[in-house]
Amino acid sequence: LLDTRQFLIYNEDHKRCVDAVSPSAVQTAACNQDAESQKFRWVSESQIMSVAFKLCLGVPSKTDWVAITLYACDSKSEFQKWECKNDTLLGIKGEDLFFNYGNRQEKNIMLYKGSGLWSRWKIYGTTDNLCSRGYEAMYTLLGNANGATCAFPFKFENKWYADCTSAGRSDGWLWCGTTTDYDTDKLFGYCPLKFEGSESLWNKDPLTSVSYQINSKSALTWHQARKSCQQQNAELLSITEIHEQTYLTGLTSSLTSGLWIGLNSLSFNSGWQWSDRSPFRYLNWLPGSPSAEPGKSCVSLNPGKNAKWENLECVQKLGYICKKGNTTLNSFVIPSESDVPTHCPSQWWPYAGHCYKIHRDEKKIQRDALTTCRKEGGDLTSIHTIEELDFIISQLGYEPNDELWIGLNDIKIQMYFEWSDGTPVTFTKWLRGEPSHENNRQEDCVVMKGKDGYWADRGCEWPLGYICKMKSRSQGPEIVEVEKGCRKGWKKHHFYCYMIGHTLSTFAEANQTCNNENAYLTTIEDRYEQAFLTSFVGLRPEKYFWTGLSDIQTKGTFQWTIEEEVRFTHWNSDMPGRKPGCVAMRTGIAGGLWDVLKCDEKAKFVCKHWAEGVTHPPKPTT
């Protein structure tokens, strides 16, 4: 059976696959997924290994019309380095010489300057090029190689291994060499895979059942450390509770060097955040941290300094801490907007079972603002999801120059932020450089400010506007209001009407449904429309909603289904990547972010059209 990293190299023109007959004969044959001789896999960023021989595809020289055969894998050899060129060409790195079918006289696969159909290769059974099943480095644990990546294939006791092995062990623990010759270099580490006994790599907190892995012997950059955690279905450490910090202080007390944790300010326009999307509500900085020096965007925990945190350059090589298991954040359920009939007094705006009101003109210190909200039957607003924040920004009349109190504060316990309405902290969205908690003045209260409505801590004695929130009063079944300029069941935002398509549909079916409604799959023109759409669909239980964006017409170039320029994007991490497809908005923890899906997947969708009676603004000139 093919494992997910293995593939057959297929030439569509001949409908045949590459077949390693012997190390010196790499030819083609009728495709057979059970033939070991036809299985290949990437073993580094640029090397392709024959699974049958555990040898790598290479050439004797970078010249036209030489035979491609198999060689002992050598990550330094220029003659074994391959790269995908445009579309389905595979070429030797740095040259316009391609992996070619050969010809009637030449049965062997050849290196050739021609880029026609005989030089075009796909993964058998797919439309993808060979790089779509690229190499993913596997970071080792423990061992003696400072967490270096596995080197496949590697030699142990004169035998070659293309996967992690338990050779030499009686307990089933899986390991790999981190250089191609373990016998000479003696460098190895354990693989971040599940095997009997691998749970002893983790320390479980008996109180919370959360597990932590301390990799103090490793030396990785922040991004490498994060990847290593993710390879174990975990994330770099987040700390949201004082108990958790105490437990980790104990766990790391015998160590001296810094360890990467998930805290970072890598997002261009927002502040400190945890990589696992936990709220940044507990602060434990080392005195003098975070330093404002540019580039110091990643955070380490310092065992030698009472496990306090320090921001460093992300390329430094340190140990790291991974975390997995139940988080306490999921116990607080925010009702979906559609689940709750929301009735609000005049001048209050409804959303998901609550009513909201901005007090902009009567500026008050935080304490007085809180008192006013409570007198009105509510509290300073708490915000629990990106959808709720985006509702406030897009539909409450929030303005880019606003600076408004919200309910977050650390008045009760210093450096531990809580909502004044007592709801749990499940979400934070700090401005760049925030929370700063400047030492020379107590910044115990929090404001929303700037065009995106992100947050900053502030001295509580500043007179500012504020946002109140209260539970709505249900009054029997909700009356569906018809919004001016929109048909029944459509929701208005600025000049447009929007409707959720409730039938699970492919991209094409969704597009057709919208067209039948004299509308189109939604475009997204800017941050504010995105905010509206996030609040519109983000809390719904379905995972995806189609937008009108795809690269169906020109692979690699994303376009809307209507003739409109793509002026704004909101990609999820690792998107759009190399894969072609159609774009859908995520819900849940990644609410509103865009993912590329296969166009024939089924999802709900959002239709959009001009509201009636609206004058179309002129098209922007370029």
């Epitope: 423990l142 061992g143 062990r169 623990w173 390991w175 373990y182």
Partner: nanobody, 119 residues
Framework: DVQLVESGGGLVQPGGSLRLSCAAS????????MGWYRQAPGKQREEVAA???????NYADSVKGRFTISRDNAKNTVYLQMNSLKPEDTAVYYC?????????????WGQGTLVTVSS
């Protein structure tokens, strides 16, 4: 690397008792299992008893009910309490540890301690 040091062997009369101990030291991350093996003159080495990190135990039929294996995780030490000893228990007793350490090899052996059961 990993060193195992056994102690507690000696001469004992039939029906008597002995307690063997084996301490592991070196660059050990974790010990997955520890056990006792024995080799009588002219015979193959055989497993006597083993204990996993979780505390599960296993005994050879010939010693069940007479020998007890136990472990002190904090000290990386394993013990073998031998009661009702018989002449056929005479052998060199070896300690084995299955460890996670700085080489990929897992099995480490002690030098052995001689147990003689004779009147």
């Amino acid at each position: 690397d990993v060193q195992l040091v056994e102690s507690g062997g000696g001469l004992v009369q039939p029906g008597g008792s002995l307690r063997l101990s084996c301490a592991a030291s070196g660059s050990i991350f974790t010990i997955n299992a520890m056990g006792w093996y024995r080799q009588a003159p002219g015979k193959q080495r055989e497993e006597v008893a083993a204990i996993t990190s979780g505390g599960s135990t296993n005994y050879a039929d010939s010693v069940k009910g007479r020998f007890t294996i136990s472990r002190d995780n904090a000290k990386n030490t394993v013990y073998l309490q031998m009661n009702s000893l018989k002449p056929e228990d005479t052998a060199v007793y070896y300690c084995k540890a299955v460890v996670v350490t700085t080489t990929p090899y897992s099995d480490y052996w002690g030098q052995g301690t001689l147990v003689t059961v004779s009147s």
